[in-house]
């Protein structure tokens, strides 16, 4: 399930104060978020219309097909996020791959991802002043899913 | 799109050496990965059988329903990961919500997430010794998607 991609160990010095929110600047270069869409777009095929393909990546073959929209901010960690954008309001027929079935809705699956922004610290200015990381929840759509509509009570 | 969930700022002291791989121990308490599944399980209902509900969370209403399996490792950052486990080999009929349609496959959407493992540093032991973070790619299934089967060439 896992793959080692770096040297075995990175030493952790005990140099920083014990406040839980503190990070060394170097942490920002180690981005634990995706740098490309979850399902790599290995194929030249790309869905930009409401149809389910019989080949290509998973987001093209889904009956709730989606494309990935880039959301980049060089002053955020992670810099690159990808949002799944549903290409159909309803699910596509399994038979034809093109006609929509109004009995199913194609809806985004959302996830609140933690991101960090750099902000000047209160009362500190200039290049040599300390700075802050502002932690925020940022809503990202991971994929589109074909669901049965909610039953109204 | 974003929501502030912490105090405005977390001071970043410039105290740590410049080696890119170094982290303070406190970083481990700041887990930038979800501590709950992407689609919050607000309901007591959760699918453990192959059927698509008309209510409940998205993973229950999907015609490719899935459950979330917790993957916890106290020596990993993030400690908690959730894997989507598909409950059906094929997609469920939109009409009935229970009968499977062999024309569609229910497949997991995978993503290689960067994680860090805590390891004792070479030649150091005990609670006060330094430790290392080993960086790995870890495959996580985010959701299950109903797709048209691949067309065989």
């Amino acid at each position: 399930v896992s793959l080692r991609i770096q040297e075995d160990c990175s030493h952790l010095p005990r140099c920083c104060p014990s406040k839980q929110q503190e990070f060394p600047e170097e942490w920002l270069k180690w981005n634990p978020a995706p740098v490309s869409p979850p399902e790599p777009l290995r194929h030249t095929h790309h869905p930009e219309s409401c149809r389910a393909s019989k080949d290509g990546p998973l987001n093209s073959r889904a009956i709730s097909p989606w494309s990935y929209e880039l959301d980049r901010d060089l002053n955020r960690v992670p810099q690159d996020l990808y949002h799944a954008r549903c290409l159909c309001p309803h699910c596509v027929s399994l038979q034809t791959g093109s006609h929509m079935d109004p009995m199913g809705n194609s809806v985004p699956l959302y996830h609140n991802q933690t991101v960090f922004y750099r902000r000047p610290c209160h009362g500190e200015q200039g290049a040599h002043g300390r700075y802050c990381l502002e932690r925020r929840l940022y809503r990202v759509s991971l994929a589109c899913v074909c669901v049965r509509p909610r039953m109204m009570a | 799109v974003s929501l502030r969930i912490q105090e405005d700022c977390s001071h970043l002291p410039r105290c740590c050496p410049s080696k890119q791989q170094e982290f303070p121990e406190e970083w481990l308490k700041w887990n930038p990965a979800p501590v709950s599944p992407p689609e919050p399980l607000r309901h007591t209902h959760h699918p453990e059988s192959c059927r698509a509900s008309k209510d409940g969370p998205l993973n229950s209403r999907a015609i490719s329903p899935w459950s979330y399996e917790l993957d916890r490792d106290l020596n990993r950052v993030p400690q908690d990961l959730y894997h989507a486990r598909c409950l059906c080999p094929h997609c469920v009929s939109l009409q009935t919500g229970s009968h499977m349609d062999p024309m569609g496959n229910s497949v997991p959407l995978y993503h290689n997430q960067t994680v860090f493992y805590r390891r004792p540093c070479h030649g150091e032991q005990g609670a006060h010794g330094r430790y290392c973070l080993e960086r790995r790619l870890y495959r996580v299934s985010l959701a299950c998607v109903c797709v048209r089967p691949r067309m065989m060439a």
Epitope: E25, L28, K29, V35, S36, P37, P40, L41, R42, H43, T44, H45, H46, S67, Y68, E69, L70, D71, R72, D73, L74, N75, R76, V77, Q79, D80, Y117, R118 | -
Partner: antibody
């Protein structure tokens, strides 16, 4: 008019380091990023990475990520690119370019280039 | 990494000709494609960004089109100063990558 002025040509030996500077003027430095691109003699363009001038957050190309460091100095509106452990195939013209910090990542103004020659 | 393939690798055309250069990405890049012009010994100059937007100060004879994997740069009426190398660049996924360039010569 926006200007990016780079430091002069450098000749280095294999294993040495080089630090190229890029002085920006006539725009609000912190509102943009700086990207670094190189071009080996007779070859195409190769993206090395970029830095958000306000945050200092970086992204490096995997090929050079263990040897490169990009920094900015807001007080002098200057960006720096340091490449360590130089090899002969690092011989190239190194360009800095201004880049927006958002999704549309185009390089609208470029420095004049700095020739770095690595030779024993 | 995403491969960017340009064609033709070189062309020779007369003043007033309509010139078309194509760029193909190895995978979908939506509209995250830019075009640059580079003259010998000089830095590249931005012509078109996000596939079809004309950079300020660039003559209207330059236009760009396409999305997904196939893109086109068109010079509607070639001028003597348009010689040089034209390069496409994708910015959808890091590392950003460039095409190998198309050399345009004036007949």
């Amino acid at each position: 008019q926006v200007q990016l002025v780079q430091s002069g040509a450098e000749v280095k030996k294999p294993g040495a380091s080089v630090k190229v500077s890029c002085k920006a003027s006539e725009y609000t430095f912190s509102n943009y990023g700086i990207s670094w691109v190189r071009q080996a003699p007779g070859q195409g363009l190769e993206w090395l990475g970029w830095i958000g001038a306000y945050s200092g957050f970086t992204k490096y190309a995997q090929k050079v990520q263990d040897r490169i460091t990009m920094t900015t100095d807001a007080s002098t509106t200057t960006a720096y690119m340091e490449l360590r452990n130089l090899r002969s195939d690092d011989t190239a013209v190194y360009y800095c370019a201004r880049v927006g910090t958002g999704t549309d990542s185009y390089f609208d103004f470029w420095g004049q280039g700095t020739l770095v020659t690595v030779s024993s | 990494d995403i491969q960017m393939t340009q064609s033709p690798s070189s062309l020779s055309a007369s003043v007033g000709d309509r010139v078309t250069i194509t760029c193909r990405a190895s995978q979908n890049i939506n509209s995250h494609l830019n075009w640059y012009q580079q003259k010998p010994g000089k830095a590249p100059k931005l012509l078109i960004y996000t596939a079809s937007s004309l950079q300020s100060g660039v003559p209207l004879r330059f236009s760009g089109s396409g999305s997904g994997t196939d893109f086109t740069l068109t010079i509607s009426s070639l001028q003597p100063e348009d010689f040089g190398i034209y390069i496409c660049q994708q910015t959808y996924i890091t590392p950003l990558t460039f095409g190998g360039g198309t050399k345009v010569e004036i007949k």
